[in-house]
Each structure stands twice: as structure tokens, then as C-alpha cells.
Amino acid sequence: MSSLPVPYKLPVSLSVGSCVIIKGTPIHSFINDPQLQVDFYTDMDEDSDIAFRFRVHFGNHVVMNRREFGIWMLEETTDYVPFEDGKQFELCIYVHYNEYEIKVNGIRIYGFVHRIPPSFVKMVQVSRDISLTSVCVCN
């Protein structure tokens, strides 16, 4: 299957019950600290507020945050990173009433509480050190 361009931007409309599904493979060995970044933008350009940033340091940790009024807020982290070196992953971000639920290969790793309403999200961007197979939104 051919790869998508990275960074990859996808216009979206999110609501409770939506799910963003990202499939890809890290392009570097974990010893080189490859990363995956997913941003939920509130408009179609990168200056807009970010309702949710999810950045994976493969083999290490995940950092999550949001940007409000152009200001980065309180960082949240988890060391539970069930990605495997060199193997394809499926990252699912479910939109629940109170949080984004993040699952990797079917395993829940975190719940990021909504601050900016999900209905404000207009674009998802996937970037950094991955070969990207697919990005889709289920409503």
C-alpha cells in the first residue's frame, strides 16, 4: 500500500462518537528517538488553537497538551507506550463526552480531558517520523 505524505492534513468535523484512526510505521529505530505527532487544530491553518496535541517519543513516553490563545497549557505525560520498533501501529483517538480516549493497537493508554470543545476542531494533522498508511475519521 502506498504511503500518504507527511505531514498529512485532513479536514474534519468531530463530535461525541467520532474516532480518528491512524495507521503507520515508525521510519527510524527507537534508539534514534523517532516521534509521531497528531494535532487537532481549530482552524485550517497552523496558527489556530490546538484542542489536542499527541506526541509520541517511540519507546519512551507520550506528551499531550493543548494550545489556547496561542499559549501552551499544562503538559500531560504517560510512560505507557505500547508501540513496537519497526512494526505497524494503529492509533485510535475516540471522542467521548468528557475526553479523548487514546488506544494503540486496541490498548487504552490515556484519556485526555476536553478543554476546547471537540466541535471546534476543523483539521487533524499527522506529522514527524512515520510512514503513514491511512488516516480516517469515523462518525
Epitope: 489556530s48 488553537d49 489556547e68 499559549i71 476536553h114 476546547i116 470543545p117
Partner: nanobody, 119 residues
Framework: EVQLQASGGGFVQPGGSLRLSCAAS????????MGWFRQAPGKEREFVSA?????????YYADSVKGRFTISRDNSKNTVYLQMNSLRAEDTATYYC???????????WGHGTQVTVSS
């Protein structure tokens, strides 16, 4: 649809104080940061202050108002406040409140309240 209504503006002499209020309604925004912007005649709208909804409710200020303005919020009343002390002539502007998620675009700006500082 989000509705934001700012109030509390007025005419004050240099060195004086005012307290602005902004009540929000109409959307599930309670977790969003809330903030204040201002626009002086002939100038672009500029950031004044914002307050997060994190447990430690961090406050952020433009350099020009640090030490003089204090932002606070009352989540039970869905209201954000801006206490403005030691006002200067250059603080004269229309002040707008906003919720995050629409910055820097004017999707949900509140109706402004005019502040005039003059002797």
C-alpha cells in the same frame, strides 16, 4: 452557539481602576481557557490576558499589563473578570472577552466594552 457579554467599562482618570466582567453562555465551553483582548482605534486587536481551566488556573498576561491587571474566573457563574488597576491613557480601547478554540479568528468574540482613560 456561544454568547459572550462583556461589561464594566467606563471613563476613568489615569491611575484609576475598573473591573470588567464577561458572562458566557450557550455552549459546552466550561473547560476552555477564557481571555481578554482589546482594540484601540486604528490598531489591531491585541491579547491582554487569559486564564486556563487547569486545576492551578494559570493566568497569562501581555507584558504591557503585567503587575497592573489581574484576571480571574468563577466557573459556577461561567464568568471571567479583569481587574484593571493603575490605568494609563494607552489602555484606552474596546475590551473583548473570548473563549479559546477560536483564536486568532473572531468566531466567538463577545460584544466589547469601552474603556477610556483620560484626565
Amino acid at each position: 452557539e456561544v454568547q459572550l457579554q462583556a461589561s464594566g467599562g467606563g471613563f476613568v482618570q489615569p491611575g484609576g481602576s475598573l473591573r470588567l466582567s464577561c458572562a458566557a453562555s450557550g455552549s459546552s465551553y466550561a473547560g476552555s481557557a477564557m481571555g481578554w483582548f482589546r482594540q484601540a482605534p486604528g490598531k489591531e486587536r491585541e491579547f491582554v490576558s487569559a486564564i486556563s481551566s487547569d486545576p492551578d488556573t494559570k493566568a497569562y498576561y501581555a507584558d504591557s499589563v503585567k503587575g497592573r491587571f489581574t484576571i480571574s474566573r468563577d466557573n459556577s457563574k461561567n464568568t471571567v473578570y479583569l481587574q484593571m488597576n493603575s490605568l494609563r491613557a494607552e489602555d484606552t480601547a474596546t475590551y473583548y472577552c473570548a473563549i479559546s478554540g477560536q483564536y486568532p479568528y473572531a468566531r466567538y468574540w463577545g460584544h466589547g466594552t469601552q474603556v477610556t482613560v483620560s484626565s
